[in-house]
């Protein structure tokens, strides 16, 4: 066996991409290594170049066809293989059976845009992105706001355990800037994971009118 | 958890069969690709062959390609080990090891207590 460890995990969009990380303790990061993906009920087989993300991780995305196009189903299984090549041969170097919906793995929600900002309050709405129509309401969202002189990752989560494509911030301070984030994941599914999050939206709270209470 | 004992390990002549067996209990084994390695004394775990757990897929090493056979019976919880012309090369401590994909390193998330498999000449 080859020293070390490794591993080889893959996410399903829930559309038309599945996304592949391969690493392995020593492997030489020249090494020519690609994800084939063969699935028992379909006509299509597919293949993605692993490019190296760090010292010793590849990844690529198997792109199954348009982006909103609904390429798998809940009955279908992948089988994907990482093959390196070996001088003249490929070698195989991990095989796993993907049942694409118990691996899921959403992209982050976009178009993040405040609906209404007071001085202690915000109104935010955002959209999924490529989300399949099978999940109909079985979704639920993780939020997050960066407050001044905090990180994101001491920023207090927020869930939402329903498909709610909106949240009231409350409890703002006055004429103060803020960021939020915000991640989904299906309910469905014994390996999914959540989204990336979303891209911070940057706003700010308006300031106390003078002389009044708010 | 998952816990695999393996059993079919013995003294076999050269050219002789084995049949290796991994009872699985514990979580649900539907959900693991299986595999056989084997260590002989001051060598490295090697992998001997892997079964995927839906399609069946197979791997084999190139030192056992067409005298060994892997398979599973999902509806048992076994996955077994078919060693025909066994050669004295073969001998070693077999482990059966459960993960989420066959992976050519050792570090797969559940392993056997190991069955041993002496080919004399």
């Known amino acids: 066996a080859v020293n070390g460890t490794s591993q080889f995990t893959c996410f399903y969009n829930s559309r038309a991409n599945i996304s592949c990380v391969w690493s392995q303790d020593g492997a030489l990061q020249d090494t020519s290594c690609q994800v084939h993906a063969w699935p028992d009920r379909r006509r299509w087989n597919q293949t993605c170049e692993l490019l190296p993300v760090s010292q010793a991780s590849w990844a690529c995305n198997l792109i199954l066809g348009a982006p909103d196009s609904q390429k798998l189903t809940t009955v279908d299984i992948v089988t994907l293989r990482v093959l390196c090549r070996e001088g003249v041969r490929w070698r195989v170097m991990a095989i796993q059976d993907f049942k694409p919906f118990e691996n899921l793995r959403l992209m982050a929600p976009i178009s993040l845009q405040v609906v209404h900002v007071e001085t202690h309050r915000c109104n935010i709405s955002w959209e999924i992105s490529q989300a399949s129509h099978y999940f109909e309401r079985h979704l639920e969202f993780e939020a997050r706001t960066l407050s001044p002189g905090h990180t994101w990752e001491e920023a207090p989560l927020l869930t939402l355990k329903q498909k709610q494509e909106w949240i009231c911030l409350e409890t703002l301070t006055p004429d103060t800037q803020y960021e939020f984030q915000v991640r989904v994941k299906p309910l469905q599914g014994e390996f999914t994971t959540w989204s990336p999050w979303s891209q911070p939206l940057a706003f700010r709270t308006k300031p106390a009118a003078l002389g009044k209470d708010t | 958890q998952v816990q695999l004992q393996e059993s079919g390990g013995g003294l076999v002549q050269a050219g002789g069969s084995l049949r290796l067996s991994c009872a699985v209990s514990?979580?649900?084994?539907?959900?693991?690709?299986m595999g056989w390695f084997r260590q002989a004394p001051g060598r490295e775990r090697e992998i001997v062959a892997g079964?995927?757990?839906?399609?069946?897929?197979?791997y084999y090493d190139d030192s056992v390609k067409g005298r060994f056979t892997i398979s599973r019976d999902n509806a048992k919880n076994t996955v077994y080990l078919q060693m025909n012309s066994l050669k004295p090369e073969d001998t070693a401590l077999y482990y059966c090891?459960?993960?989420?994909?066959?992976?050519?390193?050792?570090?797969?998330?559940?392993w056997g207590q190991g069955t041993q498999v002496t080919v004399s000449s």
């Open positions: 514990g979580r649900s084994f539907r959900n693991y690709v």
């Open positions: 079964i995927t757990q839906f399609t069946s897929t197979t």
């Open positions: 090891a459960a993960d989420r994909s066959i992976k050519m390193t050792a570090d797969w998330a559940y």
